[in-house]
């Protein structure tokens, strides 16, 4: 057991210790998306590469069918970047034509699905109006934060429009999580 | 040795333990860049402050000549933000003049150089079209993710145009990594 | 004490160990902001939800009056996202009217207050010119990095204009920190 002479007064001396290299971790990278059916009011989920190139899963963190599966309860840092690219959305022309003054937008959501709750929980959202003039456009949305997850929870990344996702490079669009 | 009575069933009881305060860590902050020669098809690398102000390196994580040097194999969280600023890129004027419909852009790449591979590996990329109208512009690109690195690997941050990097404040442009 | 036969040669064998679940951590989420008095040259600070929904504080990390209170010295990863939304800032019209060519902007600053320094320290800044055409706009600014903090330090998130912050959803605007 840890020598108490080294324990700060606030330390829970009997708390279980763990080797850091043993913690569940994953970094997933983008693949070309195959069109999938999704509910009208729900953004489609991306699927991912989990073992080639920079991608990996380890220590019982598994990837299956668009989901990262949480193998152990605890606090996780979860992150994702999605790079979008598209043709110009000419907002000024839209406005002049008398159509609604609502911009086009791009959105990324990291979602948790849990057995104990009927609805998915949106953990993180990055949403941006896209009102470019004059050219094709491209830009990333990055998200990352810490959440308390339960064993058996599933994580996915949803996007507003799968056809705008840049799937060309593993460093542009990715998704990861690790137990703290 | 840790008492097994406290070990969760999935714990590798004999894995080496480590004090968190002993792990390699670095947070580097921007400095004014001196123009350096770089290959035509390779983005130039930024150099960094490593000990003044908010910047630090510790526990054998060293900085030298634009590179963070990885002293120990393991999974690292790596992050960077680069704030860019520039004069207007009038995409609509460019387009009217009949020039190609390719927007100007800003790009940040976190790159790994490793002994075991002849080419640098792009770990993370943030790239954004810049097609502003009407004024000077400024904006950050943030990146962060987890990667498995080997002892002796070197990390750098490359940008598409060093002259657009905002080097005025240590909180605007930075680069860091820490062993998980 | 840890068995030395498992200790890598660089490990400080007598360094104190700590259970990860015992470390100070917090994830705070946005709430509707009440206008507060602030000094003319200082951006207003956001206040936060600390216990409902996705928000939590644990292991002596406390939230009070806009501040996260650091209970223990060490290296922390600190992050925030603020989603802004507003009506169009017609920069081109501003320019035509002969007014200064300074764009509107949105800024997020994560600030440290410490009793060993009379001024707040800006740890992280994300700042972006906003020069949209044709519509309402919305966009996030994300920040995250590692800093060495002292027991008793206080962290807050300041923004350039509190009225532009999207407070509608806990996944859009948030603030967190955890001891590494």
């Amino acid at each position: 057991l840890k020598g108490q002479e080294f324990a700060p007064s606030h330390q829970q001396v009997y708390a279980p210790l763990r080797a850091d290299g043993d913690k569940p971790r994953a970094h997933l990278t983008v693949v070309r998306q195959t069109p999938t059916q999704h509910f009208k009011n729900q953004f489609p989920a991306l699927h991912w590469e989990h073992e080639l190139g920079l991608a990996f899963t380890k220590n019982r963190m598994n990837y299956t069918n668009k989901f990262l599966l949480i193998p152990e309860s605890g606090d996780y840092f979860i992150y994702s970047q999605v790079t979008f690219r598209g043709m110009t959305s000419e907002c000024s022309e839209i406005r002049q034509a008398g159509r609604p003054n609502k911009p086009d937008s791009i959105t990324v959501v990291i979602t948790k699905v849990t057995d104990s709750y009927p609805e998915p929980t949106q953990l993180l959202m990055g949403t941006k109006s896209v009102c470019e003039v004059g050219s094709n456009w491209f830009q990333p949305i990055y998200l990352g934060a810490m959440f308390s997850l339960q064993e058996g929870d599933k994580l996915m990344v949803n996007v507003s429009d799968i056809s705008l996702v840049d799937y060309t490079k593993e460093d542009k669009t990715f998704f990861g999580a690790f137990l703290l | 040795l840790k008492g097994q009575e406290f070990a969760p069933s999935h714990q590798q009881v004999y894995a080496p333990l480590r004090a968190d305060g002993d792990k390699p860590r670095a947070h580097l902050t921007v400095v004014r860049q001196t123009p350096t020669q770089h290959f035509k098809n390779q983005f130039p690398a930024l150099h960094w402050e490593h000990e003044l102000g908010l910047a630090f390196t510790k526990n054998r994580m060293n900085y030298t000549n634009k590179f963070l040097l990885i002293p120990e194999s393991g999974d690292y969280f790596i992050y960077s933000q680069v704030t860019f600023r520039g004069m207007t890129s009038e995409c609509s004027e460019i387009r009217q003049a009949g020039r190609p419909n390719k927007p100007d852009s800003i790009t940040v790449v976190i790159t790994k150089v490793t002994d075991s591979y002849p080419e640098p590996t792009q770990l993370l990329m943030g790239t954004k079209s810049v097609c502003e109208v009407g004024s000077n512009w400024f904006q950050p690109i943030y990146l962060g993710a987890m990667f498995s690195l080997q002892e002796g690997d070197k990390l750098m941050v490359n940008v598409s145009d060093i002259s657009l990097v905002d080097y005025t404040k240590e909180d605007k442009t930075f680069f860091g990594a820490f062993l998980l | 004490l840890k068995g030395q036969e498992f200790a890598p040669s660089h490990q400080q064998v007598y360094a104190p160990l700590r259970a990860d679940g015992d470390k100070p951590r917090a994830h705070l989420t946005v709430v509707r902001q009440t206008p507060t008095q602030h000094f003319k040259n200082q951006f207003p600070a956001l206040h936060w939800e600390h216990e409902l929904g996705l928000a939590f504080t644990k292991n002596r990390m406390n939230y009070t009056n806009k501040f996260l209170l650091i209970p223990e010295s060490g290296d922390y990863f600190i992050y925030s996202q603020v989603t802004f939304r507003g009506m169009t800032s017609e920069c081109s019209e501003i320019r035509q009217a002969g007014r200064p060519n300074k764009p509107d902007s949105i800024t997020v600053v994560i600030t440290k207050v410490t009793d060993s320094y009379p001024e707040p320290t800006q740890l992280l800044m994300g700042t972006k010119s906003v020069c949209e055409v044709g519509s309402n706009w919305f966009q996030p600014i994300y920040l995250g990095a590692m800093f060495s903090l002292q027991e008793g330090d206080k962290l807050m998130v300041n923004v350039s204009d509190i009225s532009l912050v999207d407070y509608t959803k806990e996944d859009k605007t948030f603030f967190g920190a955890f001891l590494l």
Epitope: - | - | Q37, F39, N62, T64, N65, K66, F67, L69, V113, T114, D115, S116, Y117, P118, E119, P120, G152, K154
Partner: antibody, heavy 116, light 106 residues
Framework: QVQLQESGPGLVRPSQTLSLTCTVS????????MHWVRQRPGRGLEWMGR????????KYNPSLKSRVTITRDTSKNQVSLRLSSVTAADTAVYYC?????????WGQGSLVTVSS | DIQMTQSPSSLSASVGDRVTITCRAS?????MYWYQQKPGKAPKLLIY???NLASGVPSRFSGSGSGTDFTFTISSLQPEDIATYYC?????????FGQGTKVEIK
């Protein structure tokens, strides 16, 4: 504008407890840290301790720790100092000081004499 | 405790002279502060973080140094600068002040 006003009895009997209050205005003291510093006649400055008004956390000068207590009442914008078991050596001007978060600012000081 | 040794304890200089006060810490500190105290008044912060001029302080005051050795300078002494000057470290517990340097006009 910013004000820090120390108040309390100017005379305290030996072995009694010295009590002073600092009332602040013009800023939110929870954005800062509040310190007490004293200056004995013809002597230099001595830091006594500080409180974080946001959390109530305190730090004290170890040489005074057994005798000093600093508290705050944020609803009244007040910070208080108590120094127990005083002797003539505690005769001093006592200053309330704001620091951290906002520029340093000192009260004008309160002279306390310990005498029977 | 971190001991602050300030020198000289007093000095006399003419108007317009350059005045230098030194402060040595018994161990390295990151931040050093310099205060001015006029008779019957509270101290006033002049320099923070070793070299930053506090708001409203004339530019003839400056500070420098790092680690254990710090210097405070008045580039051109003015009559209103007659005061006692203190260094202080604001980090270790307890915070400690130098014993003061009394500056007088010749």
């Amino acid at each position: 504008q910013v004000q820090l006003q120390e108040s309390g009895p100017g005379l305290v009997r030996p072995s009694q407890t010295l009590s002073l209050t600092c009332t602040v205005s013009g800023f939110d003291m929870q954005d800062t840290y509040m310190h007490w510093v004293r200056q004995r006649p013809g002597r230099g400055l001595e830091w006594m301790g500080r409180i974080d008004p946001a959390s109530g956390h305190t730090k004290y000068n170890p040489s005074l720790k057994s005798r000093v207590t600093i508290t705050r009442d944020t609803s009244k914008n007040q910070v208080s100092l108590r120094l127990s078991s005083v002797t003539a050596a505690d005769t001093a001007v006592y200053y309330c000081v704001r620091s951290g978060g906002l520029p340093d600012y000192w009260g004008q000081g309160s002279l306390v004499t310990v005498s029977s | 405790d971190i001991q602050m040794t300030q020198s000289p304890s007093s000095l006399s200089a003419s108007v317009g002279d350059r005045v230098t006060i030194t402060c040595r810490a018994s161990q390295g500190v990151e931040y050093m502060y310099w205060y001015q105290q006029k008779p019957g008044k509270a101290p006033k912060l002049l320099i923070y973080g070793a070299s930053n001029l506090a708001s409203g302080v004339p530019s003839r005051f400056s500070g420098s140094g790092s680690g254990t050795d710090f210097t405070f300078t008045i580039s051109s002494l003015q009559p209103e600068d007659i005061a006692t000057y203190y260094c202080q470290q604001w980090e270790g517990n307890p915070r400690t002040f130098g014993q003061g340097t009394k500056v007088e006009i010749k």
